[in-house]
């Protein structure tokens, strides 16, 4: 099966790699602009230079292109706890990330929020915190996992899933309640 190509991809495939077809004259292949630059004017004829200009501050192109405008630099979302890992340059977008001991939770493909890694208090670290995944905790006896935190079995209600994990504790509590002195 041949993948569906857009008009621009169809036009570009006529020219060798690193070149694109002139929009007004499909017999001319112009050289693409280097990353960090954008297309100011198409090449006037075969073998003649494409007029490429450097991206202005606050914009970039990360690969060779024939874009009429550079792309705007991304801004890290402070409200999501993001910090700037590296600034935008003419050939690379801003890189955003999280602080130490935090992980990314992706709300959608390009939108993430930073959350603190769980410390596994009253438990042990089963899997360490990763860039995109919280710590996985294993709880000590007498504790159960709720929302990735180890909670005392004394907070386990009969209706919750914790009853299986906390069953010995629940039995013990019942046992001590039942055993009255005679």
């Amino acid at each position: 099966l041949v993948p569906h190509l857009g008009d621009r991809e169809k036009r570009d495939s006529v020219c060798p790699q690193g070149k694109y077809i002139h929009p007004q004259n499909n017999s001319i292949c112009c050289t693409k602009c280097h990353k960090g630059t954008y297309l100011y004017n198409d090449c006037p004829g075969p073998g003649q230079d494409t007029d490429c200009r450097e991206c202005e501050s606050g914009s970039f192109t990360a690969s060779e292109n024939h874009l009429r405008h550079c792309l705007s630099c991304s801004k890290c979302r402070k409200e999501m706890g993001q910090v700037e890992i590296s600034s935008c340059t003419v050939d690379r977008d801003t890189v955003c990330g999280c602080r130490k001991n935090q992980y990314r939770h992706y709300w959608s493909e390009n939108l993430f929020q930073c959350f603190n890694c769980s410390l596994c208090l009253n438990g042990t670290v089963h899997l360490s915190c990763q860039e995109k995944q919280n710590t996985v905790c294993t709880c000590h006896a007498g504790f159960f996992l709720r929302e990735n935190e180890c909670v005392s079995c004394s907070n386990c209600k009969k209706s919750l899933e914790c009853t299986k994990l906390c069953l010995p504790q629940i039995e013990n509590v019942k046992g001590t309640e039942d055993s009255g002195t005679t």
Partner: nanobody, 124 residues
Framework: EVQLLESGGGLVQPGGSLRLSCAAS????????MAWVRQAPGKGLEWVSF????????YYADSVRGRFTISRDNSKNTLYLQMNSLRAEDTAVYYC?????????????????WGQGTLVTVSS
Amino acid sequence: EVQLLESGGGLVQPGGSLRLSCAASGFTFHKYGMAWVRQAPGKGLEWVSFIDLAGLHTYYADSVRGRFTISRDNSKNTLYLQMNSLRAEDTAVYYCAKFATYSSGNEEQPFDYWGQGTLVTVSS
């Protein structure tokens, strides 16, 4: 067909409370993050709060943090927003929104379906 139906809006005095609900249908509710987004009169859209599919991760705008609480009941396919200590500046149309499938969302507009909205008016 995806449907999101908000309810619970109305007129409330400053300092009062309201609970908004959003009944979802036409998709597997428990597999998607959900959100509340609002639009004040003459203003743009503002992200209010998000909740992930299991309710483990939440986001609150600075303007509502500590006053609003987002929650969901996956067994009832319903999203909630408990709004306390309401202020005049909370007056807006509140929309329930579904996060787009992971690969089809984008940073500026990560939602693919919206409800019709419910009006919240905070006034004395």
